[in-house]
Interface confidence: medium
């Protein structure tokens, strides 16, 4: 089912270089390299260099693409719910008369029952059901930090709604932190956003199973609609394998440039605009590490007889269960360039130019 | 350079189905389907169904992957800077004695100079240089909304720093909104976060070229370090082409399922667990739309003679300038399932199971 042939690395590089020639011109919508006849002599103006550096800084600070998923993310996540501590618990006593906030407490031993080890947690969401409301309000979520202090987590602008709706907040880091500590009662505060110059600090949003107004109806509230944590975690028995030798590597420059990996990997390729493309019209940079992806991604036939042997290979060679998996870029980064159009220098940013890692897809 | 052969669609589907069989078992770390001997009769427990539905809701609310980049994102972006209105301008007069905030005003005609049309704007960042500071402070950014009101945009937790550092806020939507309005002065407010119960509402962060304390030094402050907007936009002359007939389509289910596209596209494939895989052990759902990617991504030889004809094809067929572009999944979504292990029902989420769109990579 596989036809093997020797890869002519030089031809692949040549094709990649030629493709980049077309890509850059195409991104700039140029039919041919711009004429350099009117370019003023001397170095680039300081303001242009500053602008180029600003753009480069931005690129350095934030990769264009999200990080490749860690190996654990490939595997299934068990989903569980942990309901907040019942409102009749004495812990809510002190919070009763506070108009700007409502409070939700959780027992960390219930969380640990679902997620025995902090690293197994993949995602934790705080889910609140907001009752219908005719007002718009800006709300904030805080985490209980120590006895009398709260740490800000995030905010939301809630617009009027005719029907109850679920709100979801990503609290993965908070729950992981709780799991790293001893058991106890931990909590969240859901507050009105109090601006430095605002007068009305009252929380107008009502949350099912918690808003003071409705305390009398608590018995009738379906438990399912009380605030809860939705947890996604790798089951303990599945986690033991994650540290085995067969784990999936990130096919990034760190690994690929220092290994002799024959299968799909990122391969080193530096493009020198002058030497490789015969171009003098790009003034900055002089060249860049374009790199490229190369190597087989074997299709795995999962016929019953071979199951246990081949299943471990899926994660690396065919995680997307493709009919013909292919070695393609995963993380890409942009490239800022400086060039002239007539006498005018331009700073432009070209998206997805640098291949940082590859994957079988 | 291209060897064409007829695609056996049925074989591709069969291979995809078999790959999915292995993928699901592999994600669950199962060597074979679990025995159904102990599964209790009757429907799934209500709590399990509720949990499954909660997980399904999450998936509905947020796609696992970011949206495919719009066509305009493929093309180069011109980068420009717009400095804030000079602090000596009378507009700052009213803001002088406010301790919780500092203000930055911009002239929208300067912005329009750089970005003549709102849709051309690809990204706008507000850049502020924060001076060294020994305190931690939670800060917020607001947009001037009407004469005396401010709209919340975002926040940041600023930790102590020994050296000046640049802060960057994404204000693309705000600047696009300004461009849609008439010319005038618009602005931002950078404030201390005032919690409902906090006492200290003073802004302790100092911003280069703006903090009141340093007003005397303004003459000496290098203009480069004054707050500015960093704008990335498609140049006007390049934009004309974006609406031409040759533009890049999103290769998603909306387009691909309703067209006869021969090149790379997402193809429909529904997996019925019982019929296609012979599995009865997955209790919910009964099946799912797995879909798959198929179709050629021609490599384009960009030899000088053909430039103008082929450059427009890059965007669709080889945007990543690959030596051998390949049709692969772009947007993927997870799949929650319910199955039994012995007598115990489990809700698990499998990542990247549903192909929503494809791309040449």
């Amino acid at each position: 089912l596989s036809t093997c042939k020797t890869i002519d690395m030089e031809l692949v590089k040549r094709k990649r270089i030629e493709a980049i020639r077309g890509q850059i011109l195409s991104k700039l919508r140029l039919a041919s390299p711009p004429s350099q006849g009117e370019v003023p002599p001397g170095p680039l103006p300081e303001a242009v260099l500053a602008l180029y550096n600003s753009t480069r800084d931005r690129v350095a600070g934030e990769s264009a693409d999200p990080e490749p998923e860690p190996e654990a993310d490939y595997y299934a996540k068990e989903v569980t719910r942990v309901l907040m501590v019942d409102r009749n618990n004495a812990i809510y006593e002190k919070t009763k008369d506070i108009s700007h906030s409502i409070y939700m407490f959780f027992n960390t031993s219930d969380i640990r029952e679902a997620v025995p080890e902090p690293p197994l947690l993949s995602r934790a969401e705080l889910r609140l059901q907001r009752l219908k409301s005719s007002v718009e309000q800006h709300v904030e979520l805080y985490q209980k930090y120590s006895n009398n202090s709260w740490r800000y987590l995030g905010n939301r602008l809630l617009t009027p709604t005719d029907t109850p709706e679920w709100l979801s907040f990503d609290v993965t880091a908070v729950v992981r932190q709780w799991l790293n500590q001893g058991d106890g009662i931990q909590g969240f505060r859901f507050s009105a956003h109090c601006s430095c110059d605002s007068k009305d600090n009252k929380l107008h949003v009502e949350i099912n199973g918690i808003s003071p107004k409705r305390r009398g109806d608590l018995g009738t509230i379906h438990d399912m609609n009380r605030p809860f944590l939705l947890l996604m975690a790798t089951p303990l028995e599945r986690a033991q394998h994650l540290h085995s030798s067969r784990h999936r590597r990130a096919l990034d420059t760190n690994y690929c440039f220092s290994s002799t990996e024959k299968n799909c990997c990122v391969r080193q390729l530096y493009i020198d605009f002058r030497k490789d493309l015969g171009w003098k019209w790009i003034h900055e940079p002089k060249g860049y590490h374009a790199n490229f992806c190369l190597g087989p991604c074997p299709y795995i036939w999962s016929l019953d007889t071979q199951y246990s042997k081949v299943l471990a290979l899926y994660n690396q060679h065919n995680p997307g269960a493709s009919a013909s998996p292919c070695c393609v870029p995963q993380a890409l980064e942009p490239l800022p360039i400086v060039y002239y159009v007539g006498r005018k220098p331009k700073v432009e940013q070209l998206s997805n130019m640098i291949v940082r890692s590859c994957k079988c897809s | 350079l291209s060897t064409c052969k007829t695609i056996d669609m049925e074989l591709v589907k069969r291979k995809r189905i078999e790959a999915i069989r292995g993928q699901i078992l592999s994600k669950l770390r199962l060597a074979s389907p679990p025995s159904q001997g102990e599964v209790p009769p009757g429907p799934l427990p209500e709590a399990v169904l509720a949990l499954y539905n909660s997980t399904r809701d999450r998936v509905a609310g947020e796609s696992a992957d970011p949206e495919p980049e719009p066509e305009a994102d493929y093309y180069a972006k011109e980068v420009t800077r717009v400095l804030m209105v000079d602090r000596n301008n009378a507009i700052y007069e009213k803001t002088k004695d406010i301790s919780h905030s500092i203000y930055m005003f911009f002239n929208t005609s300067d912005i329009r100079e750089a970005v003549p049309e709102p849709p051309l704007l690809s990204r706008a960042e507000l850049r502020l240089q924060r001076l060294k500071s020994s305190v931690e402070q939670h800060v917020e950014l607001y947009q001037k909304y009407s004469n005396n009101s401010w709209r919340y945009l975002g926040n940041r937790l600023l930790t102590p720093t020994d050296t000046p550092e640049w802060l960057s806020f994404d204000v693309t939507a705000v600047v696009r909104q300004w461009l849609n309005q008439g010319d005038g002065i618009q602005g931002f407010r950078f404030s201390a976060h005032c919690s409902c119960d906090s006492k200290d509402n003073k802004l302790h962060v100092e911003i280069n070229g703006i903090s009141p304390k340093r007003r005397g030094d303004l003459g000496t402050i290098h203009d480069m370090n004054r707050p500015f907007l960093l704008l990335m936009a498609t140049p006007l002359e390049r934009a004309q082409h974006l609406h031409s007939s040759r533009h890049r389509r999103a290769l998603d289910t909306n387009y691909c399922f309703s067209s006869t596209e021969k090149n790379c596209c997402v193809r429909q494939l529904y997996i019925d667990f019982r019929k296609d895989l012979g599995w009865k052990w997955i209790h919910e759902p009964k099946g799912y739309h797995a879909n798959f990617c198929l179709g050629p991504c021609p490599y384009i030889w960009s030899l000088d003679t053909q430039y103008s004809k082929v450059l427009a094809l890059y965007n669709q067929h080889n945007p990543g300038a690959s030596a051998s572009p390949c049709c692969v999944p772009q947007a993927l979504e997870p799949l929650p399932i319910v199955y039994y292990v012995g007598r115990k029902p489990k809700v698990e989420q499998l990542s990247n199971m549903i192909v929503r769109s494809c791309k040449c990579s």
Epitope: R112, P118, N147, D183 | -
Partner: antibody, heavy 120, light 112 residues
Framework: EVQLVESGGGLVQPGGSLRLSCAAS????????VHWVRQAPGKGLEWVSH????????YYADAVKGRFTMSRDNGKNTLYLQMNGLKSEDTAVYYC?????????????WGQGTQVTVSS | LPVLTQLSSMSGSPGQTVTITCTGS?????????LSWYQQLPGTAPKLLIY???NRASGVPNRFSGSKSGNLASLTITGLQAEDEADYYC????????????FGGGTKLTVL
Amino acid sequence: EVQLVESGGGLVQPGGSLRLSCAASGFTFSNYGVHWVRQAPGKGLEWVSHISAAGISRYYADAVKGRFTMSRDNGKNTLYLQMNGLKSEDTAVYYCAKDRIRSSYEYDSWGQGTQVTVSS
Amino acid sequence: LPVLTQLSSMSGSPGQTVTITCTGSSSNIGGGYYLSWYQQLPGTAPKLLIYNANNRASGVPNRFSGSKSGNLASLTITGLQAEDEADYYCGCYDSSLSTGYVFGGGTKLTVL
């Protein structure tokens, strides 16, 4: 009946090493976090280290960090404490203790202890 | 000095009620972490008496009870008996320390 039995204590010179073991029985060892707690002669209890149920997470007191390594073999229902670079202030009775639930930091079962003496 | 503060010694007569206190801070007892009480009889290993501040461990007589308010935890023994003579330790997770778990210095209870 839950049982924890420590062994491996003894007399050792400063800078030396010892490996303590704790054999567990009467409960599903792999489901619980376990800890080492020590008690110097005539003094109170001092928490030393903790290892989670699967052995993925380990935590140490500042006084032993970098010198002691805790590990477990769930197949053998055994807990270990590898002590290197021993100092005279490490002299104590070392107890292993089991968490009440998972990793609750509440010790519902203790071993009888093993004496470690660091002296020249 | 221990992060959890206990009186070093107390005494009481048989039949009396004694309360041993343990004072902490917002990063341990006041932070909502589970507090435990341990009894250590002379020459033996410690034994769990109270977990989660106010729950009796199995096999512990109901003469022993625990409570907590703010940064203060208490162990109360009613109807004191001779066999209650022992060292009593409180213990709690502490989020401000890299050490993680802390014990009080212990209270030596003498039954007169």
